[in-house]
């Protein structure tokens, strides 16, 4: 099949006191190989500070996956989610406060 770029969506949720979990989800992409990882101040986070979901079919002939990490509340602006798929790449910030989901379709 032809390349379908992912929709990337960054969300935040409350974790323990003073911390939040930020999750970067990529969906509706093809082929299945995708890089999704968190950066702090432009530097990649180590594997042991991130959690990944498996790359799974989403039922439409495309795939979905996610990566999450726990950060200190108030430091959201230092973190970005990096996505690389089929030679294209993009970075996605953490939404501030209780804002809505941020969807970015990468072309």
């Amino acid at each position: 099949g032809s390349t379908v770029p992912p929709m990337v969506n960054v969300t935040r949720s409350e974790a323990s006191e003073g911390n939040i979990t930020v999750t970067c989800r990529a969906s509706s992409f093809y082929p299945r190989n995708i890089i999704l990882t968190w950066r702090q101040d432009g530097v990649s986070l180590s594997h042991d500070t991130q959690q990944w979901g498996d790359v799974l079919p989403d039922g439409n002939g495309t795939y979905q996956t996610w990566v999450a990490t726990r950060i200190c509340r108030g430091e959201e602006q230092r973190f970005t989610c990096y996505m690389e798929h089929s030679g294209n790449h993009s970075t996605h910030p953490v939404p501030s406060g209780n804002s809505h989901h941020h969807h970015h379709h990468h072309h």
Epitope: N33, I35, S46, H47, D48, G53, V55, Y82, G87, N88
Partner: antibody, heavy 120, light 107 residues
Framework: QVQLKESGPGLVAPSQSLSITCTVS????????VNWVRQPPGKGLEWLGM???????DYNSALKSRLSISKDNSKSQIFLKMNSLQTDDTARYYC??????????????WGAGTTVTVSS | DIQMTQTTSSLSASLGDRVTISCSAS??????LNWYQQKPDGTVKLLIY???SLPSGVPSRFSGSGSGTDYSLTISNLEPEDIATYYC?????????FGGGTKVEIK
């Protein structure tokens, strides 16, 4: 067919800088990370750093102050520059493609390496 | 940095033998471990990734296992072309670090 080939000066004088080029074929640099790894004579492997598809870089903190990695996507080339070389920088320098998929991160294809000797 | 230790620096075995190479990390690395083979001419090849996954083209006589801090590479039936030095490598924390290598020779 994925290939990487390093080219370097061979001999570098102490305190001088080192420049090595890695020329790749069979894949696009916009969609793959490339790593630099070195191996001193008779010793093990040491990761120096990497450059991502978007040009962002990560470095081994022990060498970060002396290292710079850059690339030219159109020429399919990655460049390693290291300053203030000393004799213990004598090593074989490898570039290797990185595959970074979720829980999996590995160097799936390596160049043959280029030998750099630091000596006056 | 995480220290990777391969306590056996060299070993001799006969063709057809089962060979096991051990690798220990200075802290838990959550299966974030790869194995590489370096031939006498310096050529490096990926053998095993993520503890036990075999890349395409690598013979099935190679296998990997382990968890926590202790990992191993097994060659089930030693062949002449397996004469090489084998390195483990962790990527749980940056920087990725390698073991000192285990050289396999023919008895």
């Amino acid at each position: 067919q994925v290939q990487l080939k390093e080219s370097g000066p061979g001999l570098v004088a102490p305190s001088q800088s080192l420049s090595i080029t890695c020329t790749v074929s069979g894949f696009a640099l916009t969609g793959s990370g490339v790593n630099w790894v070195r191996q001193p004579p008779g010793k093990g492997l040491e990761w120096l750093g990497m450059i991502w598809g978007d040009g962002n870089t990560d470095y081994n903190s022990a060498l970060k102050s002396r290292l710079s990695i850059s690339k030219d996507n159109s020429k399919s080339q990655i460049f390693l520059k290291m300053n203030s070389l000393q004799t213990d920088d004598t090593a074989r320098y490898y570039c290797a493609r990185g595959a970074h998929y979720g829980k999996r991160w590995y160097f799936d294809v390596w160049g043959a390496g280029t030998t750099v000797t630091v000596s006056s | 940095d995480i220290q990777m230790t391969q306590t056996t620096s060299s070993l001799s075995a006969s063709l057809g033998d089962r060979v096991t190479i051990s690798c220990s990390a200075s802290q838990g690395i959550n299966n974030y471990l790869n194995w590489y083979q370096q031939k006498p001419d310096g050529t490096v090849k990926l053998l095993i990734y993520y503890t036990s996954s075999l890349p395409s083209g690598v013979p099935s006589r190679f296998s990997g296992s382990g968890s926590g801090t202790d990992y191993s590479l097994t060659i089930s039936n030693l062949e002449p072309e397996d004469i090489a030095t084998y390195y483990c490598q962790q990527y749980s924390k940056l920087p990725p670090t390698f073991g000192g290598g285990t050289k396999v020779e023919i008895k």
